[in-house]
C-alpha cells in the first residue's frame, strides 16, 4: 500500500493551502442514487432509471453520517427475491435470483491524533472500509457441486 | 460540496501521524473485482462470482494510477449486448438489454502544493469525480412515450 506525504493539523497551524484541495467539479447525486419516481414494487418498468427498469429492481436507502466522508451513502435494497420475467415485467421467474452486489467503499472518519508520549495533536483522518450494496443483479442460482 | 479541515505538508514537517491514517484492515480487491476464473464469454454460469452468474455477465478491467487515491479502480465491461436466457444460461434473449450501471466516484489526485509567492510546498490532494462502471444489469428496453 502506498503512502503519500500527509500531516495532522493542530490548532494554530496554517491550513490555507489545503491538503485536500477541492476541485470545482460539481458533485451531483450519484446517477444510481437518484430517487425513482415510479412506485417501489416488484416489477420492471419500461421507462425511468436503471434501477426501476432492471428485472432485479431495487430502491436506494439513505445512510447519512455528518461525521463521515462521504456523508451520504446509498444502499441498494432488492424489491424482489427472484427476477422479474422479461416477457411480462411483473411476474417473477423462480429460475433466477435477485442478489445484492456489494462493494467495500473507502470512507474517512475524523479521529484525535496522538503525538509523542501520547499527547493529543489535532485531528487525523482514519480510513475505513465500509460495505455498501450497489445494485441488485439477476443471477442463475448456484448449483452446488 | 464537502470540505475537510486539512493542511498542506511542507518539507521537514513531521508526518509520523498521518492525516490519512491508513487503517490496518487488509484491503483486498473489491469482491466483484476478483478476477473471474471462468472463461469470459456471453453465458451465465451456475457457480463462481456474481459477475459470472449474472444473466448480464461482465468482466472487470483494471484502471491503475499511482498518483490517484484509490490507485486501483475496476471498470465493469458487459460480455453480452442482451441478457442471457435464465433457462439455458447461454442463448441471448433480445427482450432484455445488458446495460452498464455507472457511478461518479470521488477520487483524489496528488498534485504539487504552491505556497506563498508560488513556491512549491509538498503535495496536496485534489478531489475529483471519476466515472466508474460498477456492473451490468439486465433491463427491459425503454419504451419511448
Amino acid at each position: 500500500y502506498s503512502h503519500w506525504p500527509s500531516c495532522c493539523p493542530s490548532k494554530g497551524q496554517d491550513t490555507s493551502e489545503e491538503l485536500l484541495r477541492w476541485s470545482t467539479v460539481p458533485v451531483p447525486p450519484l446517477e444510481p442514487a437518484r430517487p425513482n419516481r415510479h412506485p417501489e414494487s416488484c416489477r420492471a418498468s419500461e421507462d425511468g432509471p436503471l434501477n426501476s427498469r432492471a428485472i432485479s429492481p431495487w430502491r436506494y436507502e439513505l445512510d447519512r453520517d455528518l461525521n463521515r466522508l462521504p456523508q451520504d451513502l446509498y444502499h441498494a435494497r432488492c424489491l424482489c427475491p427472484h427476477c422479474v420475467s422479461l416477457q411480462t415485467g411483473s411476474h417473477m421467474d423462480p429460475r433466477g435470483n435477485s442478489e445484492l452486489l456489494y462493494h467495500n467503499q473507502t470512507v474517512f472518519y475524523r479521529r484525535p491524533c496522538h503525538g509523542e508520549k501520547g499527547t493529543h495533536k489535532g485531528y487525523c483522518l482514519e480510513r475505513r472500509l465500509y460495505r455498501v450494496s450497489l445494485a441488485c443483479v439477476c443471477v442463475r442460482p448456484r448449483v452446488m457441486g | 460540496y464537502s470540505h475537510w479541515p486539512s493542511c498542506c505538508p511542507s518539507k521537514g514537517q513531521d508526518t509520523s501521524e498521518e492525516l490519512l491514517r491508513w487503517s490496518t484492515v487488509p484491503v483486498p480487491p473489491l469482491e466483484p473485482a476478483r478476477p473471474n476464473r471462468h472463461p469470459e464469454s456471453c453465458r451465465a454460469s451456475e457457480d463462481g462470482p456474481l459477475n459470472s452468474r449474472a444473466i448480464s455477465p461482465w468482466r472487470y478491467e483494471l484502471d491503475r494510477d499511482l498518483n490517484r487515491l484509490p490507485q486501483d479502480l475496476y471498470h465493469a465491461r458487459c460480455l453480452c449486448p442482451h441478457c442471457v436466457s435464465l433457462q439455458t444460461g447461454s442463448h441471448m434473449d433480445p427482450r432484455g438489454n445488458s446495460e452498464l450501471l455507472y457511478h461518479n466516484q470521488t477520487v483524489f489526485y496528488r498534485r504539487p502544493c504552491h505556497g506563498e509567492k508560488g513556491t512549491h510546498k509538498g503535495y496536496c490532494l485534489e478531489r475529483r469525480l471519476y466515472r466508474v462502471s460498477l456492473a451490468c444489469v439486465c433491463v427491459r428496453p425503454r419504451v419511448m412515450g
Epitope: P29, P35, R64, R68, L69, D72, Y123 | -
Partner: antibody, heavy 120, light 107 residues
Framework: QVQLVQSGAEVKKPGASVKVSCKAS????????ISWVRQAPGQGLEWLGW????????KYAQKVQDRITMTTDASTTTAYMELRNLRSDDTAVYYC?????????????WGQGTLVTVSS | DIQMTQSPSSLSASVGDRVTITCRAS??????LNWYQQKPGKAPKLLIY???SLQSGVPLRFSGSGSGTDFTLTISSLQPEDFGIYIC?????????FGGGTKVEIK
C-alpha cells in the same frame, strides 16, 4: 431546554463579508450537527449547508459553496457561518438549526435568526 | 435539485375544522420528509419528522402521512394558535429543499 442563540443584526456593503455566530447550550454539542438556512424577505427557506460539530466535515449548497465557510468551536460550543463577497440578494434572515448526525436529518431546534442586510 | 410543491398555497378555516395540506416531491424521497410551522417574525418549529413521527411537545392533533412523492399534513381540529405558514422539507438528497409554504388563516 436546548437553546441556540445567534449574534445580532448586521448591515454590510456589497463585496464585504459577514460572520454570524450561533451559541449552543443545554445539549452535548459534539453529538449533533449545525445546519444553516436563510430566508429572504417574503420568500421561502433556503438550505445553505451543514457541519458535523465533532468532525468539522461540511456540506455546502452549490449556490453559495465558493463563498461560504462553516466552522465550530467545541470549547465554546459555538458554530459560525461566514459568507464572503456579499451581494444584495444575500439580504435575508440567517438561521442556525440543530441537526442529528445520522440519516434522519430534521432540524429540531432553531436559533432566533440574524438579519443580514446588504446595501450600498 | 428536488422540487417540493405544496398545495394549497393558502387556506382559511374555522376553529374545529379538519385541515389537510399536501406536499409533492419531484422525485421519490422515501420517507425523508419533515413538516415545520412558522409564525411571522419567528424561526420555524419542527412538527413532524420522517413523514409521520410527531416531534416531542407537538399536540396530537397534528399528524403526517405519505411516502415516495406524496405527503400530507393533517390538523384534525384546528385551534386558534395554529395560524401560520406550514412548510415541508426533503432531506433525502442534498441540497435539502423546502416547499414554498401553505399559509393557514383562522376564519
Amino acid at each position: 431546554q436546548v437553546q441556540l442563540v445567534q449574534s445580532g443584526a448586521e448591515v454590510k456593503k456589497p463585496g464585504a463579508s459577514v460572520k454570524v455566530s450561533c451559541k449552543a447550550s443545554e445539549y452535548t454539542f459534539s453529538n449533533y450537527g449545525i445546519s444553516w438556512v436563510r430566508q429572504a424577505p417574503g420568500q421561502g427557506l433556503e438550505w445553505l449547508g451543514w457541519i458535523g460539530a465533532y468532525s468539522g466535515f461540511t456540506k455546502y449548497a452549490q449556490k453559495v459553496q465558493d463563498r461560504i465557510t462553516m466552522t465550530t468551536d467545541a470549547s465554546t460550543t459555538t458554530a459560525y457561518m461566514e459568507l464572503r463577497n456579499l451581494r444584495s440578494d444575500d439580504t435575508a434572515v440567517y438561521y442556525c438549526a440543530r441537526v442529528g448526525t445520522g440519516t434522519d436529518s430534521y432540524f429540531d431546534f432553531w436559533g432566533q435568526g440574524t438579519l443580514v442586510t446588504v446595501s450600498s | 435539485d428536488i422540487q417540493m410543491t405544496q398545495s394549497p398555497s393558502s387556506l382559511s378555516a374555522s376553529v374545529g375544522d379538519r385541515v389537510t395540506i399536501t406536499c409533492r416531491a419531484s422525485q421519490n424521497i422515501n420517507s425523508h420528509l419533515n413538516w415545520y410551522q412558522q409564525k411571522p417574525g419567528k424561526a420555524p418549529k419542527l412538527l413532524i419528522y420522517t413523514a409521520s413521527s410527531l416531534q416531542s411537545g407537538v399536540p396530537l392533533r397534528f399528524s403526517g402521512s405519505g411516502s415516495g412523492t406524496d405527503f400530507t399534513l393533517t390538523i384534525s381540529s384546528l385551534q386558534p394558535e395554529d395560524f401560520g405558514i406550514y412548510i415541508c422539507q426533503q432531506t433525502y438528497i442534498t441540497p435539502l429543499t423546502f416547499g414554498g409554504g401553505t399559509k393557514v388563516e383562522i376564519k
